[in-house]
């Protein structure tokens, strides 16, 4: 039977019909009482007092309603949940993930996890309704957990008409013996000891460092990973592991040459709620590698949306060469990551100027052969984009990647809903298309337009009459990603390039074939 539920947009928690709850009002000391009525939350302010007993974890401030027994926790930055038990900054799980309290909510199949409080899970052995739910990390959320001491975090997903448990795609903090770091590397305890320039790190207990804050003599040295060694560390919450070095007989510091553990192609996918011509409205967290490129034009004031882009490393964006035919000076370009609405700033978005961009020197503006470009983001350090739930790199494909014909893949972008529309989409969209066999990706299938071996085709293969809403890329999506699932990660297969109209039956979109450019990409990204 269909149940009316309310979803609190601020906290993403769900509530049954007539259920009530308290919620803190962001950036204020006020508290609201909310009530679920016919699928809509109705909220108003209520008076509160300090709790008579501590109920919040991780330094949360507890307040209880003056006239009834409910309480609410004001959580410090980095924590969330009814009792501030959720660590929003946890980027990976340790060991089996029993103590994992992060916000990963995608199963290995790519399915979205079900909220542990969902009534559909009431009869399951593990749900948010258990008396020990808080201790197990379960509650009014859909984040991956390991309450039963299984081998790694898992969740319930709705598949084949029923709810079943599935392991999550949450990254593990230590991938075997790979010497790499997660997040900003605060927890890195590996043995790399060279800086990005190739200099050797000084031991943290070196006499030369006397007077420096971060040395083996620091009272918290052990907790910070400092000691009688010269391994790279990040004791001060910098962008990545670093160390002290002597350069030209001068004491300085440099970032280290430690690879970051790849979380590329992992995302927290949420099922799109709204269909729109040409695709579905989407959230940026489902496509965290999507970039929006804006340009200042010499003739008109302000910036206007130019093209899509794809985050492939902290400081590099891949896009289409044809987007840059106007030869904009790099300082006229802006790249925005983490944005769901095309022209509305997102809460967690990251904005960058462009240091330089490189258009493939054999780009042909007639045929769009070699339609590929790289943009380097401007930054004061060797890191630019900071990984988060809405900003993450896509995986580049292995050189020998050959996906079967008709593999279902997806594209995303802020482009038009249809070819004749005068406007770009106000919100990010996604579209689901299938890879065409090369025999169906030829000039004769595309009105005698030149199709080269550097291109691939993909389109919506569903049948349908004139009213069918076929998925496709459209003007404004150019430069954005065509990604396919490979080895559990979303992998970049194509760059949106060109097409004949948008969403026409049996007319695929044309994409730059990324596997043909892996060496070009690597070559141009060199330090």
């Amino acid at each position: 039977s269909y149940q009316v539920i309310c979803r609190d947009e601020k906290t993403q928690m769900i509530y049954q019909q007539h259920q009530s709850w308290l919620r803190p009002v962001l950036r204020s000391n006020r508290v609201e009482y909310c009530w679920c009525n016919s699928g809509r939350a109705q909220c108003h302010s209520v008076p509160v007092k300090s709790c008579s007993e501590p109920r919040c974890f991780n330094g949360g401030t507890c307040q209880q309603a003056l006239y009834f027994s409910d309480f609410v926790c004001q959580c410090p930055e980095g924590f969330a949940g009814k009792c501030c038990e959720i660590d929003t900054r946890a980027t990976c799980y340790e060991d089996q993930g029993i103590s994992y309290r992060g916000t990963w909510s995608t199963a290995e199949s790519g399915a979205e996890c079900t909220n542990w409080n969902s009534s559909a899970l009431a009869q399951k052995p593990y749900s948010g309704r258990r008396p020990d739910a808080i201790r197990l990390g379960l509650g009014n959320h859909n984040y991956c957990r390991n309450p039963d001491r299984d081998s790694k975090p898992w969740c319930y997903v709705f598949k084949a008409g029923k709810y079943s448990s599935e392991f999550c795609s949450t990254p593990a903090c230590s991938e075997g013996n790979s010497d790499c770091y997660f997040g900003n590397g605060s927890a890195y305890r590996g043995t790399h000891s060279l800086t990005e320039s190739g200099a050797s790190c000084l031991p943290w207990n070196s006499m030369i460092l006397i007077g420096k804050v971060y040395t083996a003599q620091n009272p918290s040295a052990q907790a910070l990973g400092l000691g009688k060694h010269n391994y790279c560390r990040n004791p001060d919450g910098d962008a990545k592991p670093w160390c002290h070095v002597l350069k030209n007989r001068r004491l300085t510091w440099e970032y280290c040459d430690v690879p970051s553990c790849s979380t590329c192609g992992l995302r927290q996918y949420s099922q799109p709620q709204f269909r729109i011509k040409g695709g579905l409205f989407a959230d940026i967290a489902s496509h965290p590698w999507q970039a929006a490129i804006f340009a200042k034009h010499r003739r008109s004031p302000g910036e206007r949306f130019l093209c899509g882009g794809i985050l492939i490393s902290s400081c590099w964006i891949l896009s289409a060469a044809h987007c840059f035919q106007e030869r904009f000076p790099p300082h006229h370009l802006t790249v925005i990551l983490g944005r769901t609405y095309r022209v509305v700033p997102g809460e967690e978005e990251q904005k960058f100027e462009v240091e330089k961009y490189i258009v493939h020197k054999e780009f042909d503006d007639d045929t769009y052969d070699n339609d590929i470009a790289l943009l380097q983001l401007k930054s004061d350090s060797s890191r630019c984009a900071q990984e988060s739930s809405v900003v993450r790199t896509v995986c580049l494909p292995p050189a020998d990647l050959q996906l079967p014909d008709w593999t279902e893949c997806e594209l995303s972008g802020y482009g038009k809903h249809e070819a004749l529309s005068p406007f770009y989409s106000e919100r990010l969209k996604e579209a689901h298309v299938r890879l065409y066999p090369s025999s169906r990706c030829t000039s004769q299938h595309l009105l005698n337009r030149t199709v080269t071996d550097n291109m691939l085709c993909a389109g919506d293969t569903r049948s349908g009459g004139p009213q069918a809403n076929l998925h496709d890329a459209c003007q404004g999506d150019s430069g954005g990603p065509l990604v396919c699932l490979n080895d559990g990660r979303m992998t970049l297969v194509g760059i949106i390039s060109w097409g004949l109209g948008c969403g026409q039956k049996d007319v695929p979109g044309v994409y730059t074939k990324v596997t043909n450019y892996l060496d070009w990409i690597r070559d141009n990204m060199r330090p």
């Epitope: 190739g198 490189i358 020197k361 292995p398 050189a399 690597r522 141009n524």
Partner: antibody, heavy 114, light 112 residues
Framework: QVQLVQSGAEVKKPGASVKVSCKAS??????INWVRQATGQGLEWMGR????????GYAQKFQGRVTMTRDTSISTAYMELSSLRSEDTAVYYC?????????WGQGTLVTVSS | DVVMTQSPLSLPVTPGEPASISCRSS???????????LDWYLQKPGQSPQLLIY???NRASGVPDRFSGSGSGTDFTLKISRVEAEDVGVYYC?????????FGGGTKVEIK
Amino acid sequence: QVQLVQSGAEVKKPGASVKVSCKASGNTSYWINWVRQATGQGLEWMGRIDPGGGSTGYAQKFQGRVTMTRDTSISTAYMELSSLRSEDTAVYYCASYYYAMAYWGQGTLVTVSS
Amino acid sequence: DVVMTQSPLSLPVTPGEPASISCRSSQSIVHSNGNTYLDWYLQKPGQSPQLLIYKVSNRASGVPDRFSGSGSGTDFTLKISRVEAEDVGVYYCFQGSHVPWTFGGGTKVEIK
């Protein structure tokens, strides 16, 4: 610190193929380049492979005769040269490239002789 | 292909004296990403080559500061301010900007 250890010397007949391995330890995410040096001669760049994605770039001179591959599970890169001739007798080096070829293997002597 | 021409072919030196090796490329070796990938390598007798200077003028880790690199466009120079006995070997310039990457023919530095 990156360390590169190459396979041992090989003696091959003209027309045969040789496959040289290069095992990396340390940061293994950088290009592996192959450079050869005939006795008493200079250095000659043959090509490169990205150990992560496996993409390659070869010098035109060796195109069609050289194949560079890698096995990420054992952090090893391979260079196979086919249709060997006497002028392929040389020491073959692998070198790891980040900002330059900062780390080199010890070299593998390949002798082509009938 | 970019041809790298080194001079002199042979350089007899006196310990404590300066030395200079020139390298000229047949075309500009500025990469499309704006960097100039001009490196200098030293191959000591019976050893693998070792990196001295990268990207024209950056000294590699552990390389003594008596070695310096300079130049731009097509003309590049490696200087040793005071030659020491351990500096003997063959010095190669190398361009990594255009495929195929190419080495110079080498300059043999030996003690007089």
